[in-house]
């Protein structure tokens, strides 16, 4: 099963870094909604990693979409101050890793991720799909990423930020990788899988930008996200090819991608069973 | 049926704690479906949800951040009741106050007949 | 938090109108909304839950509709006892939020 299916394009398989987001919206892209407000409000910018401001038209638009620059930075920024994180210093875990597992009130009995502070570890539980907190995660990954130690006790996220002076663009600092790279693709290849609400368990595929590769999840027939694809194919095409490597030489060898996308189309109503 | 039940005091001085009890009658405080909370009410602030409890194989709660330093709220098994503390109160804690059950899919279905309880020396 | 914001803040109605309140999210709240109705000097009384689900004795001329996080209580045709205020509530995320409510007053 061949990662590629385009000729011309050269795509390293080494682990890419990730861009960490502490909420999936953040990797929304601005919407001003379809009415005609002139409203200002600030929206995470997953290129740039900064808070931006953005006229909002004052209805519908996406969760990316803050009153205050402060806000913005809370729920969407991990350190303001510093955007290196150094690998010989550990990361400082978001608090909510902290917060015990919570089902909340409610009876849907959904299978989540919470990190356990006693043993140190992302385990399983079961949430009832209301309330609860914010030590809930989709996929065990994205909790290990968030709230695990890595194997020699630093933060499993040691990739760092800095802006490049030279053209003011974003090259990820890393102890894995020698190479640079940059994503410039579609910023719903950088939300975490979301198998939604329903009770189906199609073969679907995300794109897990913690390792840079298409991977499969089951999609229960209704909402989630648009990191969804049918294919393995379909999701290499819309996502991997927006990863630019830099070569270390100062070559540049940009990934060939196409214009027109074809996605899985997603029903984003809920279907509710009955006595949840 | 579920009914409520809520007794306290309506008068508290300023710096003291507010106690509200609330008894559970048609339900149990422990039950793994339910959950059970207080709000208050006053003309400034609307309806402002303090915090519940809930018992899912064992005990949790949550409570509004705007209280969170002050509030415990414990249940009773042994009356089948649980209760508000509110500790250091001054005038801006005069309200009604409510107890409410949280159904299993998480409106509050049945709620107390409220206390008005006043915080003035 | 999520903010829930209601309009109108309050409307004049008839006996036999009909009557629709509107009620917005900050954020999605799915289907996790309650509507209730409190009269004064009492509790407030569920009518709706999860959007759009009447609760058991709660009069079939009250309806609800709306996911994400545009929300409606239509009152089909109003009666005398209908008139009160009426709130709407998210319980999709913690902490749980209101609405600031909507007087339906006689005209």
């Known amino acids: 099963d061949s990662e590629e299916d385009e000729e011309h394009t050269i795509i390293t398989d080494t682990e890419l870094p990730p861009l960490k987001l502490m909420h999936s919206f953040c990797a929304f892209k601005a919407d001003d909604g379809p009415c005609k407000a002139i409203m200002k409000r600030f929206f995470f910018n997953i290129f740039t990693r900064q808070c931006e401001e953005f006229i909002y038209g004052g209805c519908e638009g996406n969760q990316n979409r803050f009153e205050s620059l402060e806000e913005c930075k809370k729920m969407c920024t991990r350190d303001n101050a510093n955007r290196i994180i150094k690998t010989t210093l550990q990361q400082e875990k978001p608090d909510f890793c902290f917060l015990e597992e919570d089902p909340g009130i409610c009876r849907g009995y959904i299978t989540r991720y919470f990190y356990n502070n006693q043993t140190k570890q992302c385990e399983r539980f079961k949430y009832g799909g209301c309330l609860g907190n914010m030590n809930n995660f989709e996929t065990l990954e994205e909790c290990k990423n968030i709230c695990e130690d890595g194997p020699n006790g630093f933060q499993v996220d040691n990739y760092g930020t800095q802006l490049n002076a030279v053209n003011n663009s974003l090259t990820p600092q890393s102890t894995k990788v020698p190479s640079l790279f940059e994503f410039h693709g579609p910023s719903w290849c950088l939300t975490p899988a979301d198998r939604g609400l329903c009770r189906a368990n199609e073969n679907r595929f995300y794109y897990n930008s913690v390792i840079g590769k298409c991977r499969p999840f089951k999609y229960s027939g209704c909402g989630g996200n648009e990191n969804n694809f049918t294919s393995k194919q379909e999701c290499l095409r819309a996502c991997k090819k927006g990863f630019i490597q830099r070569i270390s030489k100062g070559g540049l060898i940009k990934t060939k991608r196409k214009r027109k996308k074809q996605r899985v189309k997603i029903a984003y109503e809920e279907i509710f069973v009955k006595n949840m | 049926q579920v009914q409520l039940q809520q007794s306290g005091p309506g008068l508290v001085k300023p710096s003291q704690t507010l106690s509200l009890t609330c008894a559970i009658s048609g339900d149990s405080v422990s039950s793994n479906s339910a959950a059970w909370g207080w709000i208050r009410q006053s003309p400034g602030r609307g309806l402002e949800w303090l915090g519940m409890i809930y018992h899912r194989s064992k005990w949790y709660n949550d409570y509004a951040v705007s209280v969170k330093s002050r509030i415990t709220i414990n249940p009773d098994t042994s009356k089948n009741q649980f209760s508000l503390q509110l500790n250091s109160v001054t005038p801006e804690d005069t309200a009604v106050y409510y107890c409410?059950?949280?159904?299993?899919?998480?409106?509050?279905?049945?709620w107390g007949q409220g206390t008005l309880v006043t915080v003035s020396s | 938090d999520i903010q829930m914001t209601q309009s109108p803040s309050s409307l004049s109605a008839s006996v036999g109108d009909r009557v629709t309140i509107t009620c917005r999210a900050s954020?999605?709240?799915?289907?996790?909304l309650a509507w209730y109705q409190q009269k004064p000097g009492k509790a407030p009384k569920l009518l709706i839950y999860?959007?759009?689900n009447l609760q058991s004795g709660v009069p079939s001329r009250f309806s609800g509709s709306g996911s994400g996080t545009d929300f409606t209580l239509t009152i089909s045709s109003l009666q005398p006892e209908d008139f009160a205020v009426y709130y709407c509530h998210q319980y999709s995320d913690s902490p749980v939020t209101f609405g600031q409510g909507t007087k339906v007053e006689i005209k």
């Open positions: 954020q999605s709240i799915r289907s996790y």
């Open positions: 999860k959007a759009s």
């Open positions: 409410a059950r949280y159904s299993s899919i998480g409106h509050m279905d049945y």
